[in-house]
Amino acid sequence: QNCSGPCRCPDEPAPRCPAGVSLVLDGCGCCRVCAKQLGELCTERDPCDPHKGLFCHFGSPANRKIGVCTAKDGAPCIFGGTVYRSGESFQSSCKYQCTCLDGAVGCMPLCSMDVRLPSPDCPFPRRVKLPGKCCEEWVCDEPKDQTVVGPALAAYRLEDTFGPDPTMIRANCLVQTTEWSACSKTCGMGISTRVTNDNASCRLEKQSRLCMVRPCEADLEENIKKGKKCIRTPKISKPIKFELSGCTSMKTYRAKFCGVCTDGRCCTPHRTTTLPVEFKCPDGEVMKKNMMFIKTCACHYNCPGDNDIFESLYYRKMYGDMA
């Protein structure tokens, strides 16, 4: 429980944390662990998630060894006419779980953003809104003529895939790669995924990359000139270092970010590329992660409905990725 003994970490690599849970160095500076969340028990070795403003509250007496993860006192947030306390979580709609953190609101999608490739048993997968259900679900359309199943596998929907490229058909393997999904966060560091079978065993595998559509500190509307309605790609700002779970990128990057549209359109990445970024952690460990870099952004009216202010930024695909 405490840090008096020598460092002893499990032999296996760092644990895989659930979505939204930070991988952090334990309180002894020894091992990488999944950070404890609001209301969970914490110890010196099992720290709370610092990226959510949580600290281990031991209460009294002060020498207690086990505490509870508690939110730090900070500025409340104004959201949809309601005031939320810092650390307070709420659902803005059935699709988003939001948290107030020191005056600003961040939201995570509750609906899965998985992708589904055509397959022999489901040649025409479609996402549909089912009555009484909040999240869209995958359904399989039966082809009218069973003889078209083969060609149907090659007839990808533009919004989901690049291919097929005739050169990508290998022996007994039709190589398929979906587009990268939208970034999981509207601002700050998020994750984007895609599915591919472009590997030796022709097995479907999920690939992920880090992404940042815009920094959370950016007040992008300030840059919109009078009379204009949007700023797609703000002028490249000064070089920045990226941060990930307490680790900092070893290089600085002059990254492009997406702006905003004030006329109801959505502003999202349009052309992107994927590059490796090396992060150095406080314990000296270096980790290499693939990250999305934006080439161009686009403002468009193709926004899902529901009038949810986050809908315009989620579930949009990123076209023209170079990797």
Epitope: A75, I78, R85, S86, D102, G103, D219
Partner: antibody, heavy 116, light 105 residues
């Protein structure tokens, strides 16, 4: 550019009223609270309270109830501080500030001088 | 809730200046720091204990543990001479420290 621009200095007689304005530009006005802070000559910062720019609901700090009123005119993206029955001890610079991860944007301050 | 700062701190150019802010169980609150030069409005230099707004030099850093938050200015420059205020939230109330006058000798 994100800015809060306040009205100019005021010289008032004891017992009079004053209304200080704070005009916001460069960001979505009703997404962030506006706070008011007082600084008497040679003294530190003193928090007066804040106004919810979405609902217009004010919150006053201890010692700033009664004579102090926060209000809004969202059509011109402006917050107001009105002080009635002015006293000599109200002589101070009054600041408005936006809160987002701390008070990240401040007005230039309005000097209110109360003479007897 | 009370935040206590030393009234004054002196430092030689190029040296490290540390300004403390103490309050009961301050680690349970986010601490912010503001710099105020004579005749000017305060400027946010540290928020959420350790974070620096863009445009604030890297020599400014913050920490918060136990009952004390600390603003550290490494390689202090003459232009850093100013009053510094710590600030925290207590429930839904803002509390400022009394301020510290930093003199660069």
């Amino acid at each position: 550019e994100v800015q809060l621009v306040q009205s100019g200095s005021e010289l008032k007689k004891s017992g009079a009223s004053v209304k200080v304005s704070c005009k916001a530009s460069g960001y979505t006005f009703n997404n962030y609270a506006i706070h008011w802070v007082r600084q008497a000559p040679g003294q530190g910062l003193e928090w007066m309270g804040w106004i919810n720019t979405n609902t217009g609901n004010p919150t006053y700090a201890q010692g700033f109830t009664g004579r102090f009123v926060f209000s809004l005119d969202t059509s011109v993206r402006t917050a107001y501080l009105q002080i009635s029955s002015l006293k000599a001890e109200d002589t101070a610079v009054y600041y408005c500030a936006r809160v987002r991860y701390g008070m990240d944007v401040w007005g230039q301050g309005t000097m209110v001088t109360v003479s007897s | 809730y009370v935040l206590t700062q030393p009234p004054s701190v002196s430092v030689s150019p190029g040296q490290t200046a540390s300004i403390t802010c103490s309050g009961d169980n301050l680690r349970s609150k986010y601490a912010s720091w503001y710099q105020q030069k004579p005749g000017q409005s305060p400027v946010l230099v540290i928020y959420q204990d350790t974070k620096r707004p863009s445009g604030v030099p890297e020599r400014f850093s913050g920490s918060n543990s136990g009952n004390t938050a600390t603003l550290t200015i490494s390689g202090t420059q003459a232009m850093d001479e100013a009053d510094y205020y710590c600030q925290a939230w207590d429930s839904n109330t803002v509390v400022f420290g009394g301020g510290t006058e930093l003199t660069v000798l």
